[in-house]
């Protein structure tokens, strides 16, 4: 038969013949010949290959460096890389999660719209009229102004986006 010019999906062409690629989790030791199949070897501890391949070296698992605020979210296998995430209170700086930064706090006058996760930062929003935030926080939402009326009190000092209203007693009518 004529030598092939193309091979099947999990094969590669070498020396005018199609050889089987190595399966995920294994690296290439030697190409196939007319008399032997492709020889592959499992990746070592802390190594992986995640595709059918002809690599002669496995990739090292990612190291989740605690000095960068990282921890292991999912341990790597011979077929998958380690997945890192950030310590509590921190989030990844990129999709690859190579380092972490502290969650942002929302300044007074702003409240938390969305609490941060391991991969996304805090989202803040300005407190609208009728709401306030007097603290810098990564968790607190804007609080509604106190309703003086429901306490049979009157507004003595108007609220702002950073302060609550101040309620006081109603002026008594004198006889």
């Amino acid at each position: 038969p004529e030598p092939p010019t193309a091979c099947r999906e999990k094969q590669y062409l070498i020396n005018s013949q199609c050889c089987s690629l190595c399966q995920p989790g294994q690296k290439l030791v030697s190409d196939c010949t007319e008399f032997t199949e492709t020889e592959c070897l499992p990746c070592g501890e802390s190594e992986f290959l995640d595709t059918w391949n002809r690599e002669t070296h496995c990739h090292q698992h990612k190291y989740c460096d605690p000095n960068l605020g990282l921890r292991v979210q999912q341990k790597g296998t011979s077929e998958t890389d380690t997945i890192c995430t950030c310590e509590e209170g921190w989030h990844c700086t990129s999709e690859a999660c190579e380092s972490c930064v502290l969650h942002r706090s929302c300044s007074p006058g702003f409240g938390v719209k969305q609490i941060a996760t391991g991969v996304s930062d805090t989202i803040c929003e300005p407190c609208p009229v009728g709401f306030f935030s007097n603290v810098s926080s990564a968790f607190e939402k804007c609080h509604p102004w106190t309703s003086c009326e429901t306490k049979d009190l009157v507004v003595q000092q108007a609220g702002t986006n950073k302060t609550d209203v101040v309620c006081g007693p109603q002026d008594r009518l004198r006889a």
Partner: antibody
């Protein structure tokens, strides 16, 4: 004449183990990959595992990975399937099938054994 | 993994009829498609490999065609011994090796 003869089937309880054998003759056994294919009662064909001819590289269907082990003894012209942690859904006729190539990248199965029935039930 | 879908799942025909069974792959498999015949209580038997090549000893009334994703098995003139279940199988992206769900050919 190519012949494949399976043996080792039978009734086993869930969680139990069984070892199937396939005795081959009529061809150069080590030159070809070998497969196990199963067929549940009244159902279609399901490929289970493959082992390459010389080196003995293996690959498994997800449904049996970690529970079944395929192996071969080229000096005895025999293929094996060690089945552990058996479940009800493993009940089937198990066929050994000869590949037309040496490696595990799969090709037509030109010869099949007659099959051996494995029943997993308490 | 590549999925193989056969149609119809069952078919009634008479001796002498021309019958066509189709097989569709979920992605292109070039011409790496095989057909098997299985009779009740028996092992499958290879009929056609590489989409259109007739396996040695198989009668010439069986033929296969197609490439890419769509394939057909044709029996030009049904004989009594052809009533069986037919399976397609891809061998392009393997392992895993995947079969169609089968087409049962019955006597009308």
């Amino acid at each position: 004449e190519v012949q494949l003869v399976e043996s080792g089937g039978g009734l086993v309880q869930p969680g139990g183990s069984l070892r199937l054998s396939c005795a081959a003759s009529g061809f150069t056994f080590s030159s070809y990959a070998m497969n196990w294919v199963r067929q549940a009662p009244g159902k279609g064909l399901e490929w289970v595992s493959i082992i390459s001819g010389t080196i003995g590289k293996t690959y498994y269907a997800d449904s049996v990975k970690g529970r079944f082990t395929i192996s071969r003894d080229n000096s005895k012209n025999t293929l094996y399937l060690q089945m552990n942690s058996l479940r009800g859904e493993d009940t089937a006729v198990y066929y050994c099938a000869k590949d037309t190539e040496r490696d595990i990248t799969g090709s037509p199965f030109d010869y099949w054994g007659q099959g051996t029935l494995v029943t997993v039930s308490s | 993994d590549i999925q193989m879908t056969q149609s119809p799942s069952s078919l009634s025909a008479s001796v002498g009829d021309r019958v066509t069974i189709t097989c569709r792959a979920s992605q292109s498999i070039s011409s790496y498609l095989n057909w098997y015949q299985q009779k009740p209580g028996k092992a499958p038997k290879l009929l056609i490999y590489a989409a259109s090549s007739l396996q040695s000893g198989v009668p010439s009334r069986f033929s296969g065609s197609g490439s890419g994703t769509d394939f057909t098995l044709t029996i030009s003139s049904l004989q009594p011994e052809d009533f069986a279940t037919y399976y397609c199988q891809q061998s392009y992206s393997t392992p895993p090796i995947t079969f169609g769900q089968g087409t049962r050919l019955e006597i009308k």
